[in-house]
Interface confidence: low
């Protein structure tokens, strides 16, 4: 807390300018009018104030706006944003994408801080959904943003926003998140032709069901092993050897290197050894010839 002291004669600030960088903290407190500061916030970011001086300026704004800053001030906070606490930000009503961009720019190159997370949360809640422009902006600054959302939050993403998603934005998504995103992606890209569709949908396939993988196997897509290894195990298990061969195309040879890892390992255990041998890869662990395979899950469903 800065003590209240009278402003020395001749030091009263007429405007926010570079002369203030030489003011001590108590002088800033005493000589800078909060209302003047609020109207000239755009200058604060450009003037090279120290963090200590910014603390004083923040204190003045807090006194002027105890219920939270107006957006006209928020948009020009610049480096002062780094001084805000999540509690401060929860008082704000940020509706402009330009304001959001301006504040994200200040934090650019750093991890997502609690302040930024709170800001984004306030903004998205205010908008009601993650529209394409917002998602575009957020993933540009934070590629991992999408995967930081819960499946429930992701359900508010409209399919049209999926066009803004890049493959790297999904790198840290888990299967539950891809389960939500995949149907949206399928809807978003439904009017594309086969090869273009596969390029776009590929990153989302960790949420694809068996029937969609079967359909893709009929389209000569040549899925790479990295994508195959991210597929849901329960979606891969029902695929036949022929379907996996068609799905992977020339990449099928990579199965040998992955035979001890899921989902390949579990898939091998479900295939007839005879069928696996037709691949000529030396995959072992299939069902020996002459054994009868009972699908107990089907039996339970019927009883």
């Amino acid at each position: 807390e800065v003590e209240k002291t009278a402003c020395p004669s001749g030091k009263k600030a007429r405007e926010i300018d570079e002369s203030l960088i030489f003011y001590k903290k108590w002088e800033l407190e005493a000589c800078v009018d909060a209302a003047l500061l609020a109207t000239q916030m755009d200058r604060v970011n450009a003037i090279p104030f120290t963090y200590e001086q910014l603390d004083v300026l923040k204190h003045k704004l807090d006194e002027l706006y105890p219920q939270g800053y107006p957006e006209s001030v928020i948009q020009h906070l610049g480096y002062l944003f780094l001084k805000m606490s999540p509690e401060d930000i929860r008082k704000w009503n940020v509706t402009s994408l330009e304001t959001l961009k301006a504040l994200l720019e200040v934090n650019k190159g750093h991890e997502m801080s609690p302040q930024v997370a709170t800001l984004i949360d306030r903004f998205v809640k205010g908008r009601g959904q993650l529209d394409k422009d917002t998602l575009d902006t957020l993933t540009a600054f934070y590629p991992g943003y999408l995967c930081s959302l819960s499946p429930e939050e992701l359900s508010s993403v409209p399919p049209s926003s999926i066009w803004a998603v890049r493959p790297q934005d999904l790198d840290t998504c888990d299967p539950r998140q891809l389960d939500v995103l995949y149907p949206k992606a399928r809807l978003a890209f439904q009017n594309m032709n086969g090869s273009e569709y596969f390029v776009k949908i590929q990153s989302f396939l960790g949420g694809a069901p068996t029937e969609d993988l079967k359909a893709l196997s009929q389209q000569n897509v040549s899925m790479d092993l990295a994508t195959f290894m991210k597929l849901r195990t329960d979606a891969v298990l029902p695929l036949t050897v022929a379907e996996v061969q068609k799905l992977l195309g020339p990449h099928v040879e990579g199965l040998k290197a992955e035979e001890r890892h899921r989902p390949v390992r579990d898939w091998i255990l479900r295939q007839r050894q005879d069928d696996l041998d037709t691949l000529g890869l030396g995959l072992q662990g299939g069902i020996p010839n002459g054994y009868l395979v009972l699908d107990l899950s089907m039996q339970e469903a019927l009883s």
Epitope: N45, A46, P48, F49, T50, Y51, L54, Y79, K108, G109
Partner: nanobody
Framework: EVQLVESGGGLVQPGGSLRLSCAAS????????MGWFRQAPGKGRELVAS????????YYPDSVEGRFTISRDNAKRMVYLQMNSLRAEDTAVYYC???????????WGQGTQVTVSS
């Protein structure tokens, strides 16, 4: 240790131009702001330009806006101040200064004299 060495000062006629250079060494980070200050005889030190090395945001006070331009070359660790339309009141010792972002300017050069006179 951070060292700043200015050059380019001298005598120039009103309306003329000068380009000051500042060579920086010993920096451990690009996360620095650089500034040019000046001090006229009997007056306090005045900031005339600053630039962030990481995002190139520049700042000029009204007294030099449009006449002075600060620029940098991160690779060479150089900062420049191009001064055009010089006036008699621009006469001062010009100092190059550096600081970590949002800290006080805590590294200073020795200064270079600029005299504007006919």
């Amino acid at each position: 240790e951070v060292q700043l060495v200015e050059s380019g000062g001298g005598l120039v006629q009103p309306g003329g131009s000068l380009r000051l250079s500042c060579a920086a060494s010993g920096f451990i980070s690009n996360f620095y702001s650089m500034g040019w200050f000046r001090q006229a005889p009997g007056k306090g030190r005045e900031l005339v330009a600053s630039i962030n090395s990481f995002d190139s945001i520049t700042y000029y006070p009204d007294s030099v806006e449009g006449r002075f331009t600060i620029s940098r070359d991160n690779a060479k660790r150089m900062v420049y101040l191009q001064m055009n339309s010089l006036r008699a009141e621009d006469t001062a010792v010009y100092y190059c200064a550096a600081r970590l972002v949002r800290q006080a300017f805590n590294y200073w050069g020795q200064g270079t004299q600029v005299t504007v006179s006919s």
